[in-house]
């Protein structure tokens, strides 16, 4: 119930990508506005995005302190002009979120290939580590340095004349792998985190050939 | 605050099965791997294998394999870890421990009291 | 599998400082290898003092840090006391499984 110039929100729906976190839900604000309220399991309400005509909220600042808790929104509607005025049961209209773990849920980001190295018939490819919004000692943490051992990463590589791929693993951001001597290579990496059981795998990077501006070739 | 509280002693015969349990709280029981280590009389320590809770992944030393079974019970927060087969280089203190998580640390920060296992016909 | 090697025992003055170096047979300790120190007290149970190379837990006195000095993981204790007096454990991370040394014996002395 509650007054009959608002409605509650709904599909409430957790985007995140490598930590940045955002709240979206439906519908269109028609003559009314929208609180966001976030909290832990055991913690307090905290609210964001006051009065906002927004179907959005960035709960980034509050999902990084600490990305292992297990989190809740909720989502307030208040007739536009009026947000003193309540529903019939005396409250506002809320509706509340899924539960969201971002450590096992945010989605990987795209990687990207930051350089390859040919030494011979030897290719060294690594993997820059991405900048998270986590922070520690006020200094941004990598990727690598949130998800640790839980973190590696796949490579896919072919020769440039073929559609034929290989692959390799890395538990760090750089693959060692063996290529035929004379043959130009393409390489893309996939961010993957074997133990979870949602958002397993980034998209692909995008493709990198040899013979192009990212790599260094040294004959020996 | 984290606290991990585990089963008390057994006494199995060889061949036997025991199942140790690990009651966690404190802290988001599905996000911290819960890691398993032994120590036999007058020996140093030893990893059996981990489990995460959330998603019910586990890794085990070669060493156990098919005879080491971790699983995990969300509703009480509380993970188990089997041993099957047992013989008496078994007897040993079982323990489990967590990380402390600060932005990035995987390991062995917090552990339980230790559930002594002893093996004898 | 890897082995990782300790110290069998080391001894430090009181006030003294003291570095205890954890070995891979695989070559190279890099921060990869997550590496974690232990420390046992007869009594006391177990409890960890740094893990992913060099985060103290909140419970780790600044006394004790831990780096990768070389090809070795280290965990160093400056001005050495009494209840420092215990075992302590040193595991590293291999892909997809931690190998524990033997343990070093520290004596307070």
């Known amino acids: 119930s509650g007054t009959t110039n608002t409605v509650a929100a709904y599909n409430l729906t957790w985007k995140s990508t490598n930590f940045k976190t955002i709240l979206e839900w439906e519908p269109k604000p028609v003559n009314q506005v929208y609180t966001v309220q976030i909290s832990t399991k055991s913690g307090d309400w905290k609210s964001k995005c006051f009065y906002t005509t927004d179907t959005e909220c960035d709960l980034t600042d509050e999902i990084v302190k600490d990305v292992k808790q297990t989190y809740l929104a909720r989502v307030f509607s208040y007739p536009a002009g009026n947000v003193e005025s309540t529903g019939s049961a005396g409250e506002p209209l809320y509706e509340n979120s899924p539960e969201f773990t971002p450590y096992l849920e945010t989605n990987l980001g795209q990687p990207t290939i930051q350089s390859f190295e040919q030494v011979g018939t030897k290719v060294n490819v690594t993997v820059e580590d991405e900048r998270t919004l986590v922070r520690r000692n006020n200094t941004f943490l990598s990727l690598r340095d949130v998800f640790g051992k839980d973190l590696i990463y796949t490579l896919y590589y072919w020769k440039s004349s073929s559609s034929g791929k290989k692959t390799a693993k890395t538990n760090t951001n750089e693959f060692l792998i063996d290529v035929d001597k004379g043959e130009n290579y393409c390489f893309s990496v996939q961010a993957v985190i074997p133990s979870r059981t949602v958002n397993r795998k980034s998209t692909d990077s995008p493709v990198e050939c040899m013979g192009q501006e990212k790599g260094e070739f040294r004959e020996i | 605050q984290v606290q991990l509280q585990e089963s008390g002693a057994e006494v199995k015969k060889p061949g036997a099965s025991v199942k140790v349990s690990c009651k966690a709280s404190?802290?988001?029981?599905?996000?911290?791997?819960i890691e398993w280590v032994r120590q036999a009389p007058g020996q140093g320590l030893e990893w059996m294998g981990e489990?995460?809770?959330?998603?019910?992944?586990?890794k085990y030393n070669e060493k156990f394999k098919g005879r080491v079974t971790m699983t995990r019970d969300t509703s009480t927060s509380t993970v188990y870890m089997e041993l099957s087969s047992l013989r008496s280089e078994d007897t040993a203190v079982y323990y489990c421990?967590?990380?402390?998580?600060?932005?990035?640390?995987?390991?062995?920060?917090?552990w339980g009291q230790g559930t002594l296992v002893t093996v004898s016909s | 599998q890897a082995v990782v090697t300790q110290e069998p025992s080391l001894t430090v003055s009181p006030g003294g400082t003291v570095t205890l170096t954890c070995r891979s047979s695989t070559g190279a300790v890099t921060t990869s290898n997550y590496a974690n120190w232990v420390q046992e007290k007869p009594g006391h149970g177990f409890k960890g003092l740094i893990s992913?190379?060099?985060n103290r837990g909140p419970w780790t006195t600044a006394r004790f840090s831990g780096s990768i000095l070389g090809d070795k993981a280290v965990l160093t204790l400056w001005g050495a006391h009494a209840e420092d007096e215990a075992d302590y454990f040193c595991?590293?991370?291999?892909?997809?499984?931690?190998?524990f040394g033997g343990g070093t014996k520290l004596t307070v002395l």
């Open positions: 595991a590293l991370w291999y892909s997809n499984h931690w190998v």
């Open positions: 404190g802290y988001t029981f599905s996000s911290y791997w």
């Open positions: 489990i995460l809770p959330g998603s019910a992944s586990t």
């Open positions: 421990a967590r990380d402390y998580y600060y932005g990035s640390s995987y390991g062995f920060a917090y």
């Open positions: 992913g190379t060099n």
